[in-house]
């Protein structure tokens, strides 16, 4: 008999949903490793980055309803009491405890589909989600450390003679900024209360044969490059070109 083992390779399916919202579903990678088990069934946890403002679907282990007694989703969000959504097969009843976010729901009736959905993921959905399937011979668990990703707003401008500033504003997690060519750079990070981070990189180029510089912003939501032509005139400002 096989209990699923933790797997680092994520199977992220993306499609378009109503209201033009992207939807991602992270369920078990079918090529997972399995092992023999007795009564203690392995706990499987997956770290899952998901973009803000998309829809997310979280899945339980692959166990047929006929084998189940109770299905429970346990949701632990920062600064909130633990929320549980439970379905008891024998009585066909669902029960919720401390669940206030109406965007987190069963995909459909739990007797038809045990998946959990988060409609329009927000920063506040960062947390731990766990499906617990109770069978007569033990429990199966599937856990998700949900990390909400926020795409930073990227700007690039020249503020002084041969000095450029590249900013990745309110990203989650913090973006990484690099320059081509490399210059004399200073980078600062500003942390916001909602968990986002603004990264500001200021670079100066003494070498006069450098006329165009590129700021490259790396982020889990995608990478972005902007370039600017360095103006020799002090105090002149030039906005960036995206490519």
């Amino acid at each position: 008999e096989g209990a699923a083992q933790p797997n680092n390779s994520l199977m992220l399916q993306t499609s378009k949903e109503n209201h033009a919202l992207a939807s991602s579903s992270l369920c078990m990678d079918e090529k997972q490793i399995t092992q023999n088990y007795s009564k203690v069934l392995a706990e499987v946890n997956t770290s899952w980055p998901v973009k803000m403002a998309t829809n997310a679907v979280l899945c339980c282990p692959p166990i047929a309803l006929r084998n189940l007694i109770i299905i429970t989703w346990e949701i632990i969000l920062r600064g909130q009491p633990s929320c549980t959504k439970a379905y008891k097969k024998e009585t066909n009843e669902t029960k919720e405890t401390n669940c206030t976010d109406e965007r987190i729901t069963w995909v459909s009736r739990p007797d038809q589909n045990s998946d959990l959905q988060i409609r329009t993921v927000a920063i506040t959905h960062d947390g731990y989600y766990r499906c617990i399937m109770v069978t007569p011979d033990g429990n199966f668990h599937r856990g998700y450390h949900l990390q909400v990703l926020v795409t930073p707003e990227v700007t690039l401008f020249q503020n002084r003679n041969r000095t450029a500033v590249c900013k990745a504003v309110a990203g989650k997690p913090a973006a990484h900024i690099s320059w081509i060519p490399e210059g004399d750079c200073a980078t600062k990070q500003e942390y916001w209360s909602n968990g986002t981070v603004t990264v500001k990189s200021t670079c100066h180029w003494e070498v006069h044969n450098v006329s165009t510089v590129t700021c490259h912003v790396s982020h889990l939501t995608g990478n972005k490059s902007l370039y600017i032509e360095l103006l020799p005139v002090p105090g002149a400002k030039k906005s960036a070109k995206l490519y």
Partner: antibody
């Protein structure tokens, strides 16, 4: 070690009934759903139905509804499959198989019981 | 009900050959990231033996020359290098709510 041991071969006349037993050992009998599957000579495997000894839930293939009856004796850790109104086309090997939770797969099978229906 | 169509129904092969068997479902057997398709081997007078479960997971104790792939409606069982003990009949099987078996593929000695 998980084992499923079935009753011996049977020869029946058309119109009669047959009851095949499947004795389970090596695990808690009430914890797992038991399926019944048959295989006629040279034919594909065919699902008859299942019984969940935990709560006595049963489900049958439409083809066998009204003719097949699945029961279990928890104290004896035994599942039974009774098929009535036998016809010659019911001649087959009948298997019990324990459904394992993860993926709803069959790791453990009985050795099979040959039921011959002949006048 | 979901119908499973296996092909070929029989094939002749030699020891060491790579063998591929396909199974097509009348509708998708994949749900919630899992494909509820299993593969069994059966020898005369014996019950089926599980080889692959959930489309691609190798059952404990099964040689690594057996592998499974596919999702949705199309699935494949591959034996990378056929061994003398592999001559048997192979079945695909779906078991989510209702149980269905494919028609079987008999692998014979060439």
């Amino acid at each position: 070690e998980v084992q499923l041991v079935q009753s011996g071969a049977e020869v029946k006349k058309p119109g009669a009934s047959v009851k095949v037993s499947c004795k389970a050992s090596g695990y808690t009998f009430t914890s797992y759903v038991m399926f019944w599957v048959r295989q006629a000579p040279g034919q594909r495997l065919e699902w008859i139905g299942y019984i969940n000894p935990y709560n006595d839930d049963t489900k049958y293939n439409e083809k066998f509804k009204g003719r097949a009856t699945l029961t279990s004796d928890k104290s004896a850790s035994t599942a039974y499959m009774e098929l009535s109104s036998l016809r010659s086309e019911d001649t087959a090997v009948y298997y019990c198989a324990r459904e394992d939770y993860y993926g709803s797969r069959f790791v453990y099978w009985g050795q099979g019981t040959l039921v011959t229906v002949s006048s | 009900d979901i119908q499973l169509t296996q092909s070929p129904s029989s094939l002749s092969a030699s020891v060491g050959d790579r063998v591929t068997i396909t199974c097509r479902a009348s509708k998708s057997v994949s749900t919630s990231g899992y494909s509820y398709m299993h593969w069994y081997q059966q020898k005369p007078g014996k019950p089926p033996k599980l080889l692959i479960y959930l489309a691609s997971n190798l059952e404990s104790g099964v040689p690594s020359r057996f592998s499974g792939s596919g999702s949705g409606t199309d699935f494949t069982l591959t034996i990378s290098s056929l061994q003398p003990e592999d001559f048997a009949t192979y079945y695909c099987q779906h078991n989510r709510e209702l149980l269905t078996f494919g028609g079987g593929t008999k692998v014979e000695i060439k």
